[in-house]
């Protein structure tokens, strides 16, 4: 059976393609695909920020090659940023044990 | 219940701290901690590459700030690289559906 970290990487890849294949370039997320991914797969990150300007800003921040889409590399950078935010929270509570899966 | 992608990010964080806290700086992986993490948590990635020179080379590639340790940001870059390798494999088989979790 795959280890949890390998499963986690597999989830990162499969989640991207679950949404990227819906419209246009099947290997990139356009704005509506990104919005759907965030809303359904990262609700804790998104919170109440569902207004159009917030999505536009996020899209712009992720889209480093400025093609109005988020490719897999840009998506990985995004997930790494969220992971680093989670890690900062974790390191702020050094006695807190990692949640057991 | 947390969504699979949120769980995946949690696993990324918790796996790092499971090993980083064993010796020295508890928020960084030294070479032996990294070796143990790779061997136990990413056996598919590691494969047969268990020789010392390979570990040294990997450690050197990950350690972008040259402090002989891998911090969380460097670890995220590493995982992103593995995810991108997995994604390239995935995109090479466009008809392959994402594995359902």
């Amino acid at each position: 059976m795959a280890c949890p970290l390998e499963k986690a990487l597999d989830v990162m890849v499969s989640t991207f393609h679950k949404y990227s294949g819906k419209e246009g370039d099947k290997f990139k997320l356009n704005k509506s695909e990104l919005k759907e991914l965030l809303t359904r797969e990262l609700p804790s990150f998104l919170g109440k920020r569902t207004d159009e300007a917030a999505f536009q800003k996020l899209m712009s921040n992720l889209d480093s090659n400025r093609d109005n889409e988020v490719d897999f590399q840009e998506y990985c950078v995004f997930l790494s940023c969220i992971a680093m935010m989670c890690n900062e929270f974790f390191e702020g509570f050094p006695d807190k044990q990692p949640r057991k899966k | 219940m947390a969504c699979p992608l949120e769980k995946a990010l949690d696993v990324m964080v918790s796996t790092f701290h499971k090993y980083s806290g064993k010796e020295g700086d508890k928020f960084k992986l030294n070479k032996s901690e990294l070796k143990e993490l790779l061997t136990r948590e990413l056996p598919s990635f590691l494969g047969k590459r268990t020789d010392e020179a390979a570990f040294q080379k990997l450690m050197s590639n990950l350690d972008s700030n040259r402090d002989n340790e891998v911090d969380f940001q460097e670890y995220c870059v590493f995982l992103s690289c593995i995810a991108m390798m997995c994604n390239e494999f995935f995109e090479g088989f466009p008809d392959k559906q994402p594995r359902k979790k």
Epitope: G24, K31, A53, Q56, K57, M59, S60, N61, S64, N65, R66, D67, N68 | -
Partner: antibody, heavy 120, light 107 residues
């Protein structure tokens, strides 16, 4: 309101470097915008040169790639253009612009422009 | 690079006229098309972005349409302050590229 102001020498000798500064007021270098350099040649043709944005991400026009450098100083709300090995073909009005985060990333604010003449 | 071709390069019109300017891209730009107005001695000003969205403060007599490679800017009733040069610009991919401009002159 956002205002951009270009500054720098109006005359540059061939083979030398052109250096311009854009000072931004009314907005800070937030992660939401990219900051661009665009030039307009005497015949009115507009050319996008490059930009700097989120996390210091930089993109250049490939036609200038070996000669151009864009940097910024977030503490001063300024960004800079350096173009090396200039020729008379680089004579143009140089504009600094802000690139919006909206669809298509339009240039929503422009400086008034500064004319740079390359001549011996 | 994506080439942007504007037509006509100039036109003469009278106040109150309906004016149409076209812009053609060398490949599909997926509606990522922006329009600018420039008056002599001034910097260009954004009019419309993403084909048809009006930038704040721009009068509603300006409108845009199109898809794929072909796009249009329309001024429904030309006003004296509209005599200027108009540029299209693709925001689909890098490097950003502009059309050659259309000069709208008084007939």
């Amino acid at each position: 309101d956002v205002q951009l102001q270009e500054s720098g020498p109006g005359l540059v000798k061939p083979s030398q470097s052109l250096s311009l500064t854009c000072s931004v007021t009314g907005d800070s270098f937030t992660n939401d915008y990219y900051w661009n350099w665009i030039r307009q040649f005497p015949g009115s043709k507009l050319e996008w040169m490059g930009h700097i944005g989120y996390g210091g991400n930089i993109n250049y026009n490939p036609s200038l790639k070996n000669r151009i450098s864009i940097t910024r100083d977030t503490s001063k709300n300024q960004f800079f253009l350096r173009l090396t090995s200039v020729t008379t073909e680089d004579t143009a009005t140089y504009y600094c612009t802000r690139e919006s985060f909206y669809d298509g990333y339009p240039f929503d604010y422009w400086g008034q422009g500064t004319l740079v003449t390359v001549s011996a | 690079d994506i080439q942007m071709t504007q037509s006509p390069s100039s036109l003469s019109a009278s106040v109150g006229d309906r004016v149409t300017i076209t812009c053609r891209a060398s490949q599909d730009i997926r509606n990522y098309l922006n329009w600018y107005q420039q008056k002599p001695g001034k910097a260009p000003k954004l009019l419309l972005y993403y084909t048809s969205r009006l930038h704040s403060g721009v009068p509603s007599r300006f409108s845009g349409s199109g898809s794929g490679t072909d796009y249009t800017l329309t001024i429904s009733s030309l006003q004296p302050e509209d005599f200027a040069t108009y540029y299209c610009q693709q925001g689909n991919s890098l490097p950003r590229t502009f059309g050659g401009g259309t000069k709208v002159e008084i007939k």
